[in-house]
Structures are given as C-alpha cells and as structure tokens.
C-alpha cells in the first residue's frame, strides 16, 4: 500500500487496521413519543427513527426498542440534542404569587446499560432550570463526549418529562454514536 | 507493517485504508458580517474566516461564498456554535405592559445544499426563546452531529437574525466539519 | 492485509497508516475543586479526575496539574461541558431595586498553552448572561470543536467562577480530547 514506507519501524499497532467506512455508526432522529408508563422517579427513555430521513444505522450498529446496541468494543463518541418546549413554567407563576420559588427544570441523560451490571450508568447529563417569564418557551440541551464501551452495551436517552420534548422535526432532537 | 499479524483473517475491509491525516477537515471562525442582505433573507447564511487564526481548511475541503464544499462522499461530523447577544427582548417589555407575550427567539440552522435537489436540507437546528429580564443578554447555541454526505454537497450556517451574532472573537462563534 | 486490493493504485497516503485504537484520547470528569488563588481578571482552571469512574487517558495522552498534555501533533476534537448552579443572580435583585441592570454571567474557556509562546490561546468560549427570576438556577455550557495541535501543547478548562461549578456528578461536568 502506497505510503507504507513512511511507517516508522518502531510503530506499535495495538489493534487491527481497518477501513473507517466499516465502523459502527448511527444517527437517530426524533419521532412522536407514545406515552408509556414508567417507574416513579425514573426518567422515561425516548424512542427514535433509525432509517427514514436523516436517520441511519450502519456496520452492525443496531437500534431496537429505544436502545442503540454497541456491536464491538472501543471508544465511541456519543451525542444527543433534545429540544424542549412548554408553557410558562410553574416557577414564574409561583413567584408572582409570592410563594417559595423552586424552579422547574429540564434534564437529558444519556445512559449506558450493561446486561452483566445491575445498575445503568449515566454517561452524560444536561440539566437546566426553567423559570421563564414568557408564556411559551423552547430551548435545546446538547450533550456529547467520548466513552469506552463494550460489545453488547446499550445506550438510551432519558428525559425528565417526555411531554415537553419537541418531536416535530428531525433536526431539533436527535441521538447518535460512532466508533472512533 | 508492524502489528499486521494481529489482523484476524476474517476481517472485511469495505473501503480502501487511508491515513487519517489525509481526510477533509475544516474549522471556520466568525468574521464581521456584511450588512448587504436581501430584504427577504429571513434566515441569512453566515460567512466565515477560513485561514487566519484558528481557522483552517485542508485535504480538499474548501470554503467559498458562505459554503463548505464537501470533496468526497462519507460520514462527516458537523458542528457549529453561534453566540448571540442583544438588548432586552421585546418579550419582557410586552410582558410589563400586560400585552400578549410571544417570546422572541434565536435560531441556528446547519443546512445542506445539493445542486441536484431544489430544496436545502436542514441537518441541525438549535432554537431558543429569549425572554430576558436583564437589559443585555448573551448566550451560545451549540450543535453537532454526524451525517452521510455526498461529494459536491455544500454546508452553510443560517441564523434567524444576523445582527445579533457575536462576531468579536473566533472562539465564540465557529463552524466545522470533518470526515470520520 | 485483506481488502488491500480495493485500494486504488493512485491513492496517496500522506501520513503513516495506524490503528485507531492507538490514538491519544482522554475523557476527564469533574472533582471537587480546591479554592486556589488566581490572578485578578484571570479565570481559574478546573482540575479533573483522570482514571476513576468514566474518566480515562490513553495512548500517551496524559493529565497533570489541570492540563491535558498533547503527545503528538495532529487534529484533535476537544470538548467540555461545565454545569453551573447558583442562587438568584444579582441581576434580578438589582432589577427589583430599580438600580442599573448589568447581568451576571457564566463563562467557560478551553485554553491552549504552548511553552514556546508567551500567551495562552483561547480555543473555545461559551459565555452566557444569567439573569434568573428563580431563587436557584442551574445550567450547562457545552463546547466542542476541532483544532490542529502540536506535540507538547497543553489544554485546560477555565471558568469565570469556580464556586458556581457543579462538581457533584461526573456526567454533568467533563472535559475530553481525542486525535482524529
């Protein structure tokens, strides 16, 4: 292969060389959420579009039942944006009434589930108080970082209130991961 | 090549191997925007610095006339941050006057233009209501995700109000893409 | 190497091929900050966890004394999220008292230090006015972009007010970089 002569003799390759186009990758986009029961104090997981429009999964990265399934061990960059929208938060109403003012909040968590481990692991959290004076508010929370994942790990996106998620457009709310 | 013996015999390479340093990449930084916008340009595209300071384009990724030009097909990570700043939004003034309260907003869209397709595709959108009680406000909107692009695709960043974009520092407002 | 026959004869490889798993990478997570003296008008740097929980450094990317040390030249994706939290900002109190209204703010800067260069370079900045009506507020600032770095460069994350940083959870405040 041309250029091989540039490889210094001391180079140590710890993993097989591979073509980048062969790496597991996914970009999932929002769909309308079906209201489902979830346990008290547990954030519901979003479900996603995985093949229409901008959404895709490739190279053995599969989406099933709200989870992205990691097909091989390695370091992955994982990202999500959730756009929330709502009416005036209780906070400003309470404030006007002169009662104690605990702000409402919106939260996104990207969670890893490992079958052999009883507790899910929170990889990323974006959380924001919402105390708007406007009657209608909307805003995104964006998250992204790199994590070492194992084959069989599952990733999901949980939110504090599924009814506040803007599901109207695939460019507003999304979730993705790719092997580095 | 040292380490080649670790490559399992069943490895399937779906694309030519290539050096990572050879991949198309760009990081563009904000410049002062020219005010000669068409009066009906309700989502103007930003133009960018592509070679001074932190900005660069490399490996056939070119910047021209507000567009990043994609030189080869593949999966790209695309990102942008736009920092907005303004005076008190009309929203809070309206609120004090007791009139209906539709919040102002700020929006960033990363758009793909394909010459063979008449409609641009919105890849990423960050949109936020702005209803500030302070007399001066400023805040960033960050976006980033992975998309499958084709050779010849063009990328641009559109904003809802070009006059609110903070163009003062290259680290506050930027736009980039790289082939994975 | 299987698949090599797919490599077109005109392919130009400008850098040695290498396994992706061999690239410098780090993901650092928040720890409780020790209050330190810092120069007036200079933002303090955060220090980080580099090996416990979700945190890691690998392939010669080392963390020492608030800095990530870049072990080889190349293009890196660098990211950070800092979650801030505080009590009602002075801004809203001042507003109620009818005094001039300069909003408080929160700022994150990812900074590059090059020993041969006297001035640090600000790579990324996220800055936001905080003028909350709620008594307690919290919100993240996320940053991420690609930069060309040189061997020996050092990266740090600076914040406008270290006392407002939420250090309680590793998924809320973090800092990472990886060679592309």
């Amino acid at each position: 292969l041309k250029g091989q002569e540039f490889a210094p003799s001391h180079q140590q390759v710890y993993a097989p060389l591979r073509a980048d186009g062969d790496k597991p990758r996914a970009h999932l986009t929002v769909v309308r959420q079906t209201p489902t029961q979830h346990f008290k104090n547990q954030f519901p997981a979003l479900h996603w579009e995985h093949e229409l429009g901008l959404a895709f999964t490739k190279n053995r990265m599969n989406y099933t039942n709200k989870f992205l399934l990691i097909p091989e061990s390695g370091d992955y960059f994982i990202y999500s944006q959730v756009t929330f929208r709502g009416m005036t938060s209780e906070c400003s109403e309470i404030r006007q009434a002169g009662r104690p003012n605990k702000p409402d909040s919106i939260t996104v968590v990207i969670t890893k589930v490992t079958d052999s481990y009883p507790e899910p692991t929170q990889l990323l959290m974006g959380t924001k108080s919402v105390c708007e004076v406007g009657s209608n508010w909307f805003q995104p929370i964006y998250l992204g970082a790199m994590f070492s994942l194992q084959e069989g790990d599952k990733l999901m996106v949980n939110v504090s209130d599924i009814s506040l998620v803007d599901y109207t457009k695939e460019d507003k709310t999304f979730f993705g991961a790719f092997l580095l | 090549l040292k380490g080649q013996e670790f490559a399992p015999s069943h490895q399937q390479v779906y694309a030519p191997l290539r050096a990572d340093g050879d991949k198309p990449r760009a990081h563009l930084t904000v410049v002062r925007q020219t005010p000669t916008q068409h009066f009906k340009n309700q989502f103007p595209a930003l133009h960018w610095e592509h070679e001074l300071g932190l900005a660069f384009t490399k490996n056939r990724m070119n910047y021209t006339n507000k567009f990043l030009l994609i030189p080869e097909s593949g999966d790209y990570f695309i990102y942008s941050q736009v920092t907005f700043r303004g005076m008190t939004s009309e929203c809070s003034e309206i609120r004090q006057a007791g009139r209906p309260n539709k919040p102002d907003s700020i929006t960033v869209v990363i758009t793909k233009v394909t010459d063979s397709y008449p409609e641009p595709t919105q890849l990423l959108m960050g949109t936020k209501s702005v209803c500030e009680v302070g007399s001066n406000w400023f805040q960033p909107i960050y976006l980033g995700a992975m998309f499958s692009l084709q050779e010849g695709d063009k990328l641009m960043v559109n904003v809802s109000d070009i006059s609110l974009v903070d163009y003062t520092k290259e680290d506050k407002t930027f736009f980039g893409a790289f082939l994975l | 190497l299987k698949g090599q026959e797919f490599a077109p004869s005109h392919q130009q490889v400008y850098a040695p091929l290498r396994a992706d798993g061999d690239k410098p990478r780090a993901h650092l997570t928040v720890v409780r900050q020790t209050p330190t003296q810092h120069f007036k008008n200079q933002f303090p740097a955060l220090h980080w966890e580099h090996e416990l929980g979700l945190a890691f450094t690998k392939n010669r990317m080392n963390y020492t004394n608030k800095f990530l040390l870049i072990p080889e030249s190349g293009d890196y994706f660098i990211y950070s999220q800092v979650t801030f939290r505080g009590m009602t900002s002075e801004c809203s109190e001042i507003r109620q008292a009818g005094r001039p209204n300069k909003p408080d703010s929160i700022t994150v800067v990812i900074t590059k230090v090059t020993d041969s260069y006297p001035e640090p370079t600000q790579l990324l900045m996220g800055t936001k006015s905080v003028c909350e009506v709620g008594s307690n507020w919290f919100q993240p600032i996320y940053l991420g972009a690609m930069f060309s770095l040189q061997e020996g460069d050092k990266l740090m994350v600076n914040v406008s007010d270290i006392s407002l940083v939420d250090y309680t959870k590793e998924d809320k405040t973090f800092f990472g970089a990886f060679l592309l």
Epitope: - | Q37, H38, V109, S160 | -
Partner: antibody
Framework: QVQLVQSGSELKKPGASVKVSCKAS????????MNWVRQAPGQGLEWMGW????????TYADDFKGRFVFSLDTSVSTAYLQISSLKAEDTAVYYC????????????WGQGTLVTVSS | DVVMTQSPLSLPVTLGQPASISCKSS???????????LEWFQQRPGQSPRRLIY???NRFSGVPDRFSGSGSGTDFTLKISRVEAEDVGVYYC?????????FGGGTKVEIK
C-alpha cells in the same frame, strides 16, 4: 415535497371581509418567507407583499396597505390573507407563494383562491 | 417603482421553432448584495404560475433545458430553443431586487 394548499373560493358582498388561508407542508414553515400575489380576471400578476414567517413581520406593497393584513399560525404552518371592506375591484385570484432559501423569489405556489365581490 | 416592460405582448410560434421574449427594467436591478434577482415565470391556462428561471440565467429544478435566460443591467431575455405544445401560456418576468417587487405585463405564447 413542498405543498401549499389554499382555502376555497369565496363570494362576498361589498364591505364584507374575507380571510384566505394557505397551509404549508413538506418543509419547515418558519424558514422561508411567504408572498401574496393578486391576479385580477384576465390580468397580470401583482406582488402584494410578503410575511416573514419567523418573526411574523409583514411587508406590504403600497397598493395593498390598509385593508390587507397578512398573518400566521405557525403551530399549523398556515399563512393568512385578510381583506376588509371588500370592493368590487378586489375580485381576483389570490395566490400564496413561498420563497426559496438562496434567492428570495417565489418558487412554490398555492393553487389560488378566487375571491368574488359582488352585490 | 421598477417598471418591467415585456415584448411582444403576444407571440405566435411554430412547434419545434425557437421563441424569444424580451424584458426591460426601468432601472438597473442589480441588488446591493451583487445579485440580479430577475426571474421568469410560466402560467399555463387555468394553472398557477410556475418558476422557470432565477437570477437571470439559472434554471429551476425540473425545468427543461430548452428554456434559457440571459441579460444584464436592464435588458433580459427568455429563450425557448424548440417550442413544444405544453409551452403554451403566459410568461412573466419579475424583479426581486427592489421593493416593491414587480412583474412584467406578460407575453402570451400560442401555437400558430
């Protein structure tokens, strides 16, 4: 695919009001301006003005200031043209037409709404 | 206001033959952003207008390549290289550079 569907024909008496709707689909409504164009029977096209679908700010050509109002309901991706104090000379087909991103002219047109003003 | 004057008013053509329509503006229609927002529209009988050409010479998506636009400053032309039966209708030029935006009076293309 981009579609603009307008409300049906209207027969009105002089002095009455009419509200024509234009429902958009197949794209993000708030990203592109919406124009209104009038065509009197057997006549050419007249640009009435446009509305910024993001901010809601209308712009009217001089001949259409006063009795003509452009409005929006972004929650249902719909633009409206309201004409008050109708006159016989307002009898025409009214078109909504959506701008493009790059050149701000009317690439996509509704099917038109015939408004007839007659006593 | 910018007045757009089209000629001829009526253009009888033979199928398969070329046709040309002229449009003159009363002032230069180059916008301050450097672009000339000159468009051509086709309106077939009983239909909504359809965009053919934008920014003087760019064909809109789906428009056959027998249609072409040219010109600069104040003089513009739409050409049909070989007229087909489906090309019958009224053609309008339009300037989008200066408010108010204005159409030409139209040119009726009919088959001889």
């Amino acid at each position: 695919q981009v579609q603009l569907v307008q409300s049906g024909s209207e027969l009105k008496k002089p002095g009455a009001s009419v509200k024509v709707s234009c429902k958009a689909s197949g794209y993000t409504f708030t990203l592109y301006g919406m124009n209104w164009v009038r065509q009197a029977p057997g006549q050419g096209l007249e640009w009435m003005g446009w509305i910024n679908t993001y901010t809601g700010e209308p712009t009217y050509a001089d001949d259409f200031k006063g009795r003509f109002v452009f409005s929006l309901d972004t929650s249902v991706s719909t633009a409206y043209l309201q004409i008050s104090s109708l006159k016989a000379e307002d009898t025409a087909v009214y078109y909504c037409a959506r701008d493009t991103a790059m050149d701000y002219a009317m690439a996509y047109w509704g099917q038109g709404t015939l408004v007839t003003v007659s006593s | 206001d910018v007045v757009m004057t089209q000629s001829p008013l009526s253009l009888p053509v033979t199928l398969g033959q070329p046709a040309s329509i002229s449009c003159k503006s009363s002032q230069n229609i180059v916008h301050s952003d450097g672009n000339t927002y000159l468009e051509w529209f086709q309106q077939r009988p009983g239909q909504s207008p359809r965009r053919l050409i934008y920014k003087v010479s760019n064909r809109f998506s789906g428009v056959p390549d027998r249609f072409s636009g040219s010109g600069s400053g104040t003089d513009f032309t739409l050409k049909i290289s070989r007229v087909e039966a489906e090309d019958v209708g009224v053609y309008y030029c339009f300037q989008g550079s200066h408010v108010p935006l204005t159409f030409g009076g139209g040119t009726k293309v009919e088959i001889k």
